[in-house]
């Protein structure tokens, strides 16, 4: 017997689709070897129609795919737009040739069945309503009108014109006429359930002269839409339930053994497993809404249902929509820790992944807020200025082409703890979520700037020093000037007479920045940070106020200007070559964006990477020539 298993018989009708799952034994070889679907001919030969190597036959072009799920030891063949020509014997199998391990599958595609001509068929989804039209002759106008449902023995009354109603239809069935038309009556049944399906007879009059009409009511459970998503990516459930439930509370639930457990609803309920990675967004007044889940996990796979009811919970007889979500562990999205840890007063550097094929996409960072239906206001973006309350302590550094951008947040407080999303205006699957945890600091910070109350005097020379521990000795040290468009690394070249320099004292491990002479534009936030290549580490921030000789303390008011400073670190000079970008208004980055709010996301993160520079360098451009400098030790 074959170790491959699947459905021996698959039957469907023309125009429909099939999704055939084949199961294989749990071995590493099986997980990685070629999977195929072939059709058996009379000669016994099996002709490949589709394989996991990317082969797709002409007759399957545009209507079939094969997906491997190595974590489940299964692969799935999806075939759409079936015709009777698809009827036949097939094999699903594993191996480099079609003579490997395989399983026989018989597929039968039938014509759509025809119904007797005297029966009117109504096909409705669960929870919807139906209006049955019952014509009659004028002479039966004064007579009783009724609708009954056929059972094995008799026809059980549903409703009649004398206002008799079957108990199971109370509040759901209405018999009425329209206007002055005395040749037709109507019966409306709302909140349809599976039990309402069956044959009905509507009748006007009694005895042989009665008018009768046969009705076949089919009540369908909605076809689950199949969604195939990668681990750590995101999924959006687009739910369209119709205008009749526009004012009801909406929900998304996941099928469990006995029930459908609500994951989120518009009444504020949210499953703790989805904290920080879910949003529910009402779309319009027509009952449309969407639910976004990011950072997909293996255990998120399953059968989902959306619906509407005043309770925000699933109720029989109310419209629903369903999905089967598959989560593929063979993911293109890099595996990163989903928790970043920081301490009060310290900093974090968060590496956000994006699709490397979309290096020019706009990058954003937003903070997930769970109140109401959940939302994610943008805090910083490649072309979005930093939100005011994050002034001097947040920047986004775009590293074009390597599939990562870095977000740095310093001067941490416990209020910064929470969930944040990395997202772009490109491939929505790459939305990722990280949880930031902030603990109370128990020791001195790694980076310290002196003097701490920095007030520079206009026209004079001003030096600030950044002290770092020996463990950072081999890393690059830098100073950057923060603006709400990024943190611009200070370039390493002279600017004429305005001498400014940075030196490193190896005995006390410090990096100094000198402004010479100080100008009004030098006022603002400066960051001292460490990094290794493109990997950013810790940062610390200082605000330098600029005052005239005779004045008192300058009012803290950061400006956008970049300082003119020279950075010379250990044996090398930072060669700052930063491209210029315009400061454009934030574009609409997704279907749910509302001003600065982006309701898109994903899971991922990095642990305990202390922050460093964040030079999105949207500001001034500087290209520099490197020079060697003498260092003072």
């Amino acid at each position: 017997k074959s170790p491959i298993f699947g459905p021996q018989e698959v039957s469907s009708i023309e125009g429909d689709s099939v999704s055939i799952t084949c199961y294989y034994p749990d071995t590493s070889v099986n997980r990685h070897t070629r999977k195929y679907w072939c059709r058996q001919g009379a000669s016994g030969m099996c002709t490949t129609l589709i394989s996991s190597n990317g082969y797709l036959s002409k007759e399957y072009s545009g209507r079939a795919n094969l997906i491997n799920f190595p974590e489940n030891n299964t692969f799935v063949i999806n075939i759409e737009q079936l015709t009777q020509d698809d009827t036949g014997s097939y094999k699903c199998g594993l191996g480099t040739s079609n003579r490997g391990l395989s399983f026989d599958v018989s597929l039968e595609v039938s014509q759509v069945p025809e119904l007797p001509s005297d029966t009117h068929v109504y096909t409705k989804d669960i929870g919807r309503n139906v209006t049955i039209e019952c014509p009659f002759k004028r002479e039966n106008a004064p007579s009783k009108k009724s609708l009954c449902k056929k059972t094995n023995q008799s026809c059980e009354l549903v409703i009649d014109s004398t206002e008799k109603v079957n108990p199971s239809y109370i509040g759901r069935a209405k018999l009425f006429m329209k206007g002055t038309d005395l040749t037709v009556f109507y019966v409306n049944i709302s909140h349809l359930t599976h039990n309402d399906a069956g044959l009905y007879i509507c009748q006007a009059g009694e005895g042989p002269s009665a008018d009768k009409k046969n009705v076949d009511l089919q009540v369908l459970a909605p076809e689950p839409e199949l969604l195939y998503k990668d681990l750590r990516s995101s999924v959006t459930f687009e739910c369209d339930l119709g205008r009749e439930v526009a004012n009801e509370a909406k929900y998304l639930c996941r099928m469990n053994k006995e029930t459908c457990d609500v994951i989120i609803n518009t009444l504020g309920k949210r499953d703790p497993d989805f904290e920080g990675r879910i949003l529910i967004t009402p779309k319009d007044d027509n009952g449309r809404f969407s639910v976004l889940i990011t950072g997909l996990r293996k255990e998120d796979a399953g059968h989902y249902q959306c619906g509407a009811h005043s309770s925000g919970l699933p109720q029989e007889g109310w419209p629903i929509q369903t999905w089967q979500l598959f989560v593929n562990e063979e993911s293109t999205i890099p595996n990163r820790r989903s928790v970043v840890k920081g301490v009060t007063g310290g900093s974090v550097a968060i590496a956000c992944p994006y699709n490397p094929k979309e290096s020019s996409s706009l990058k954003y960072w937003c903070r997930w807020e769970g109140d109401g239906n959940g939302h994610c206001p943008v805090l910083v973006g490649t072309q979005a200025q930093v939100q005011e309350e994050y002034e001097g302590r947040l920047a986004l550094f775009d590293q074009p082409g390597n599939g990562t951008y870095t977000v740095i947040l310093n001067q941490l407080t416990t209020e910064d703890a929470g969930f944040y999303w990395c997202l772009t205006n490109g491939d929505s699957r790459w939305r990722t979520t990280i949880e930031l945890q902030v603990a109370e600091a128990t020791r001195e910070p790694n980076l310290e700037v002196t003097p701490q109350n920095a007030t520079a005097v206009l026209g004079e020379t001003f030096t600030v020093s950044c002290h770092y521990p020996c463990k950072f000795y081999s890393q690059e040290k830098y100073w950057c000037k923060w603006s709400n468009k990024g943190c611009h690394i200070l370039p390493s070249h002279d600017e004429g007479a305005r001498q400014s320099s940075v030196s490193c004292d190896q005995s006390s491990q410090l990096v100094s920045m000198t402004l010479n002479p100080v100008s009004k534009e030098d006022e603002g936030w400066y960051w001292c940070g460490v990094k290794q290549g493109q990997t950013y580490g810790e940062t610390t921030a200082i605000y330098i106020a600029v005052e005239e000789r005779t004045r008192g303390s300058s009012h803290v008011n950061p400006t956008d200007a970049n300082a003119r400073a020279k950075v010379a670190l250990e044996e090398e000079v930072v060669d700052s070559s930063i491209s210029e970008k315009e400061n454009k208004a934030i574009p609409n980055p997704g279907p749910f964006a509302n001003e600065r709010e982006i309701q898109n996301v994903g899971d991922q993160a990095q642990e305990n990477r202390a922050s460093g520079d964040a030079g999105s360098a949207d500001g001034q451009s500087r290209s520099s020539s490197s020079k060697h400098h003498h260092h003072h030790h």
């Epitope: 018989e9 469907s12 009708i13 429909d16 489940n72 599976h194 369908l220 053994k257 459908c260």
Partner: nanobody, 126 residues
Framework: QVQLVESGGGLVQAGDSLRLSCAAS????????MGWFRQAPGKEREFVTT??????????YYADSVKGRFTISRDNAKNTVYLQMNSLKPDDTAVYYC?????????????????WGQGTQVTVSS
């Protein structure tokens, strides 16, 4: 909740046929698949056959030991699944259980099923 009631079991001779029925009631619209398992005295519960559906498409799975002899079918209107058993053998003697699932990852695995009937005895004498 979904309730399952089996019927049709009994005592037959080897080579005879028997038809089992499993009627589902309750929240049947949530079910995605129904099948049959069997348990002989002192043995583990064993997969026999399952039918899953999606709209007008049906998928039928059989254990190797019953392939070609047993046929599973369903009547959607009656929320009933049938097991037609032909060419019965003494080895087929067991309690036959009907099972239903809302989400079915592997039809052969009993723990994948959410609802179970009480079982009906099938005895095949030689």
């Amino acid at each position: 909740q979904v309730q399952l009631v089996e019927s049709g079991g009994g005592l037959v001779q080897a080579g005879d046929s028997l038809r089992l029925s499993c009627a589902a009631s309750g929240r049947t619209f949530t079910t995605y698949g129904m099948g049959w398992f069997r348990q002989a005295p002192g043995k583990e519960r064993e997969f026999v056959t399952t039918i899953t559906w999606s709209g007008s498409t049906n998928y039928k799975y059989y254990a190797d030991s019953v392939k070609g002899r047993f046929t599973i079918s369903r009547d959607n209107a009656k929320n009933t699944v049938y097991l037609q058993m032909n060419s019965l053998k003494p080895d087929d003697t067991a309690v036959y259980y009907c099972a239903a699932s809302t989400v079915l990852r592997d039809p052969r695995v009993p723990t994948e099923y959410d609802y179970w009937g009480q079982g009906t005895q099938v005895t095949v004498s030689s």
